[in-house]
Interface confidence: medium
């Protein structure tokens, strides 16, 4: 990530190890349009935990946790021959740091568990 | 998002509608630790498409597409009584804009399809 934020070599360096971030977020009002209640309708259902931090943007980060080790079959029972596994995603958030009137921001990488999917397990047969 | 990036009211405003972003990313080396090959082992399998943009951080953004409308049963056949549905996540990327030696950055919200899960369809009964 370091080189991405550097100026071209022929240009004077950025003073103080910081750079200019324009205010405003492109596509800020874009929203996820997922099927309703997929977390409870899934064969690998999950619950959500919301974490809140006023010095982070977005302040609210939602983490999913798979409800079961197995998957739910057509009869609504847990099928223990299958596994519910988490689907993770790396995302960026902005961390706000302030000392008096001096406010600076820094990017932070966060791992988010977005939901769960049902997989056939990898079986290691005993030799 | 607008208020998050403003200074406290008692402080002088930020000149020119930009703010200071510290170089370096917190937890930059953090990596997703998902089960291996879940996209092909899932009952709602998916494929990945990689998009690349040198003026975006991260430059590589991976999008998932569900392979089937239905889900894969124990016999490896598609069961059309169930649905494979995408799991989406809002994420932030950084957009780089440069004019000569003047480089600035702006946050952009991107919708990423992270994977797929198998759900029981919502049945709308005809009145």
């Amino acid at each position: 990530g370091e080189t991405f934020f550097q100026k071209p070599e022929s240009c004077p360096p950025v003073p103080g190890g910081s750079m200019k971030l324009d205010i405003g977020i492109i596509n800020e009002n874009q929203r996820v349009s997922m099927s309703r209640n997929i977390e409870s309708r899934s064969t690998s259902p999950w619950d959500y935990t919301v974490t809140w931090d006023p010095n982070r943007y977005p302040s609210e980060v939602v983490q999913a946790q798979c409800r079961n080790l197995g998957c739910i079959n057509a009869q609504g029972k847990e099928d223990i021959s299958m596994n519910s596994v988490p689907i993770q995603q790396e995302t960026l958030v902005v961390r706000r740091k302030h000392q008096g009137c001096s406010v600076s921001f820094q990017l932070e990488k966060v791992l988010v568990t977005v939901g769960c999917t049902c997989v056939t397990p990898v079986i290691h047969h005993v030799q | 998002g607008e208020t998050f990036f403003q200074k406290p009211e008692s402080c002088p405003p930020v000149p020119g509608g930009s703010m200071k972003l510290d170089i370096g990313i917190i937890n930059e080396n953090q990596r997703v630790s998902m089960s291996r090959n879940i996209e092909s082992r899932s009952t709602s399998p998916w494929d990945y498409t990689v998009t690349w943009d040198p003026n975006r951080y991260p430059s590589e953004v991976v999008q998932a597409q569900c392979r089937n409308l239905g889900c894969i049963n124990a016999q490896g056949k598609e069961d059309i009584s169930m649905n494979s549905v995408p799991i989406q996540q809002e994420t932030l990327v950084v957009r780089r804009k440069h004019q000569g030696c003047s480089v600035s950055f702006q946050l952009e919200k991107v919708l990423v399809t992270v994977g797929c899960t198998c759900v029981t369809p919502v049945i709308h009964h005809v009145q």
């Epitope: 798979c66 223990i80 997989v119 | -």
Partner: nanobody, 134 residues
Framework: QVQLVESGGDLVQPGGSLRLSCAAS????????IGWFRQAPGKEREGVAC???????????YYVDSVKGRFTISRDNAKNTVYLQMNSLKLEDTAVYYC????????????????????????WGNGTLVTVSS
């Protein structure tokens, strides 16, 4: 009724060894993934080791990095008991150790997640205290 009972916790010096036992009654452990979890004072509960079910998997064991090479999880089906052999104990191993059971098989890839996310477990024991102190 279904019950898990841990035993074997004690006060031990750094570098010492202990063997914890988890005895089940009211159900057969063969069908269950068994996990050992621990909670140190003022800290969150964390998974230490787990062993897959015998009847529909391979009885393979998984460990968190901090105990790999020092702890060994095993099962004695005849006694319906799972053990945690703890060697080269460190001060930071001090905690209440719990065993827990969940019906099913565990994917090797899921083991790390499973040990982090203990809420999926069906049955829990009351715990046994391990104190490592000089």
């Amino acid at each position: 009724q279904v019950q898990l009972v841990e035993s074997g916790g004690d006060l031990v010096q750094p570098g010492g060894s202990l063997r914890l036992s988890c005895a089940a009654s009211g159900f057969t452990l063969d069908d269950y993934v068994i996990g050992w979890f621990r909670q140190a004072p003022g800290k969150e509960r964390e998974g230490v080791a787990c062993i897959s079910s015998i009847s529909n998997s391979d009885g393979r064991a998984y460990y968190v990095d901090s105990v790999k090479g020092r702890f060994t999880i095993s099962r004695d089906n005849a006694k319906n008991t799972v053990y945690l052999q703890m060697n080269s104990l460190k001060l930071e191993d001090t905690a209440v150790y719990y065993c827990a059971a969940e019906r099913g098989r565990i994917d090797p890839d899921v083991a790390g997640y499973f040990l982090r996310e203990s809420y999926v477990m069906d049955y829990w024991g009351n715990g046994t205290l391990v104190t490592v102190s000089s």
